[in-house]
């Protein structure tokens, strides 16, 4: 229903901490090189005013809508101009076209450096003297760095990181209690932030009913004794706050989330047997927790998807009376009879089976012709097996660094125009997914390999869109989203590519290199190895691997060295000419 | 037994309003996904639209995206489709139907909508 005062209505829904946080989230998110202290201030001043708008909701400007509020407030900021440039210029124009103007400028990749957590008794003293303020901080610098981030799973995260902080800091060894801990929630929030990434992609390149699509798909997976219509009701809704969200209406997506999963818990019958343990939850872990239940148990008296979907002799008709339900159909059965597929499969499945009855239900003869759709789904259901079979057991093989390895090296062909540290980064996300899914039961591995490759994916032709370079990835990118993994998958070494010089500085390393966190050395390591490729894109496997097994010894012996500078300086040039020679 | 009553129908011009109405009746109304589907003369059905028990609405055919919105008032076992700018081509048979499952289950009589100057 509608309400005299928008800001009232969600500040009486969510409460002051959550308003606050949201708040904070969403400047956070548009306006990406302001400090927390600046962005703290606005909070509060957008609080005190949605506190008077609470006890009279016909207070000045009260009846304003939310774009325009946070609006004007970001548009009051000093050296708006000098800070952001063209964003200013966002500032004269009317909302909605102001609100499309800063998600415009929202930067996938802003220039902040990396955040670094703090030395663990630090981390305690300023959690223990502020923890409002502490959580704040954390919000912030996460915020600006993804903003696209799920701001109520946002708030979800820094609870947890809340909860570790007030165990481990009663601890007498902090760091060991807080290193494994805050590691892990850092891996999940950055997955998360890539997977609700792709959901924006997909809301805003091929609107709402690709992503519903993609909901109905994941739905059906986890909630089989759901209807059809209770699915649809669902993924209807998530739909929605998906796109709250992904335009910037925080506070609108999370009071929208929170009804949804009031919605699910007071229809557990309907919906799925596994809900409880979620519903038993307080909000932020409900709804975190109803993201990502267990699939319920499939019902055994499923018939075969032909009957209605081959052999009906009424398929045309029932297609042409309402083509969207129909397909929907289709895919809500064909889901929740394959937990074990992908979603990106299962709506390539659903794309061909469409494409089928366009070109069927024209013909004199409409059975005879889409008789064979099911047949004709085995190449695209064999395609994503291979790739998890062949990857895993490289995975299996090799480990994590050097699966990354491979993979970067298998990229860095396909696309050797693409930047090093954008093929380094995609390259180890891309090799993260044998640690994350390659140790999962069979069934689980094709849906977590695929729809996790896809994020990846998603995030590299996001970053390519800035600075296109390549042909191969802007071809890609540029098609459908469910088509991109198979895409990418396909390229082979890019055949134009004019090879780089050999430049012996790009191989030169200083005894620095030493001290540097392990990850900051692979990081190092990798960043030669792509340089490499690129200088020889056709170079075999076993040269690449001798050249590196060669760096890793030199590594090692002259950081073990006494004299580590001239062991570097001397032993370097010998490095960067048995490479030449090993590569030649 | 299951009922269903439409009410609402006549002529209209075109770019004008109607509003369609479906007494339900013998069935628990607020747990059932109900819809709306029209026929045009000499043509075959074609689905409007669909509204969960919850009210929302989980279905509208592209022809009338943005014209037509369906409601109910679960308290009055009531379903609605509200048909603004109306233009020829709506001309139909718009029948009010119970959806159980898969498919529709049970159908009204029909009521005529006629556009036309």
């Known amino acids: 229903e509608a309400h005299k005062s928008e800001i009232a209505h969600r500040y009486n829904d969510l409460g002051e901490q959550h308003f606050k946080g949201l708040v904070l989230i969403a400047f956070s998110q548009y306006l990406q090189k302001c400090s927390y202290d600046e962005h703290a201030k606005l909070v509060q001043e957008v609080t005190d005013f949605a506190k008077t708008c609470v006890a009279d909701e016909s207070a000045a400007n009260c009846d304003k809508s939310l774009h325009t509020l946070f609006g004007d407030k970001l548009c009051a900021i000093p050296n708006l101009r000098e800070n952001y440039g063209e964003l200013a210029d966002c500032c004269t124009k009317q909302e909605p076209e102001r609100n499309e103007c800063f998600l415009q400028h929202k930067d996938d990749n802003p220039s902040l450096p990396p955040f670094e957590r703090p030395e663990a008794e630090a981390m305690c003293t300023s959690f223990k003297e502020n923890p409002t303020t502490f959580m704040g901080h954390y919000l912030h610098e996460v915020a600006r760095r993804h903003p696209y981030f799920y701001a109520p799973e946002l708030l979800y995260y820094a609870e947890q990181y809340n909860e570790i902080l007030t165990q481990c800091c009663a601890e007498a060894d902090k760091e060991s209690c807080l290193t494994p801990k805050l590691d892990g929630v850092k891996e999940k929030a950055l997955v998360s932030s890539v997977r609700q990434r792709m959901k924006c992609s997909s809301m805003q390149k091929f609107g709402e009913r690709a992503f519903k699509a993609w909901a109905v798909a994941r739905l059906s997976q986890t909630f089989p004794n759901a209807d059809f219509a209770e699915i649809t009701k669902l993924a209807t809704d998530l739909t929605k706050v998906n796109k709250e969200c992904c335009h910037g209406d925080l506070l609108e997506c999370a009071d929208d989330r929170a009804e949804l999963a009031k919605y699910m818990c007071e229809n557990q019958a309907t919906i799925s047997s596994k809900l409880q343990t979620c519903c038993d939850k307080p909000l932020l872990k409900k709804a975190h927790c109803l993201s990502e239940v267990e699939h319920d148990t499939m019902p055994a008296d499923l018939p075969a998807i032909a009957a209605d979907f081959v052999e009906d002799q009424e398929v045309c008709k029932n297609y042409a009376e309402a083509k969207d339900v129909f397909l929907g159909t289709f895919l809500y059965e064909y889901s929740r009879r394959h937990p074990d597929y992908s979603v990106s499969l299962l709506l390539r499945l659903a794309k061909k089976y469409e494409a089928t009855l366009e070109k069927c239900c024209a013909e004199a003869n409409p059975p005879a012709c889409y008789g064979t759709v099911l047949a004709e789904f085995q190449p695209l259901v064999e395609e994503p097996k291979n790739l998890v079979k062949t990857n895993c057991d490289l995975y299996e093989k090799l480990g994590e660094y050097g699966f990354q390895n491979a993979i970067l090296v298998r990229y860095t062909q396909k696309a050797p125009q693409v930047s090093t540290p954008t093929l380094v980064e995609a390259a180890r996300n891309l090799g993260r997914v044998g640690t994350k899914c390659c140790t999962l039961p069979e069934d689980q591995r094709l849906p977590c390999v695929e729809d996790y490759l896809s994020a990846i994916l998603n995030r590299v032709c996001l970053l390519h869109e800035k600075t296109p370079v390549s042909e191969h990835v802007t071809k890609c990118c540029s098609g459908s989203l469910v088509e991109r993994r198979p895409c990418f998958s396909a390229l082979t070494v890019d055949e134009t590519y004019v090879p780089k010089e050999f430049k012996a500085e790009t191989f030169t390393f200083h005894s620095d290199i030493c001290t540097l966190p392990e990850k900051e050395k692979q990081i190092k390591k990798q960043t030669a190895l792509a340089e490499l490729v690129k200088h020889k894109p056709k170079a075999t496997a076993e040269q690449l691997k001798t050249v590196m097994d060669d760096f890793a010894q030199f590594l090692d012996t002259c950081c073990k060295a006494a004299d580590k500078d001239t062991c570097f300086s001397t032993e370097g040039p010998n490095l960067v000419t048995r490479c030449k020679d090993a590569l030649a | 037994e299951v009922q269903l009553l439409e009410s609402g129908g006549g002529l209209v011009q075109p770019g004008g309003s109607l509003r369609l109405s479906c007494a339900a009746s013998?069935?628990?109304?607020?747990?059932?996904?109900m819809g709306w589907v029209r026929q045009a003369p000499g043509k075959g059905l074609e689905w409007v639209s669909l509204?969960?028990?919850?009210?929302?609405?989980?279905y509208y055919a592209d022809s009338v995206k943005g014209r037509f919105t369906i409601s109910r008032d679960n308290s009055k076992n009531t379903l609605y489709l509200q048909m603004n700018s109306l233009r020829a081509e709506d001309t139909a048979v718009y029948y009010c139907?119970?959806?159980?499952?898969?498919?529709?289950?049970?159908w009204g009589q029909g009521t005529l909508v006629t556009v036309s100057s």
């Open positions: 013998g069935f628990t109304f607020n747990h059932y996904t």
């Open positions: 139907a119970r959806w159980s499952s898969r498919a529709f289950d049970y």
């Open positions: 509204i969960h028990p919850s009210g929302t609405v989980i």
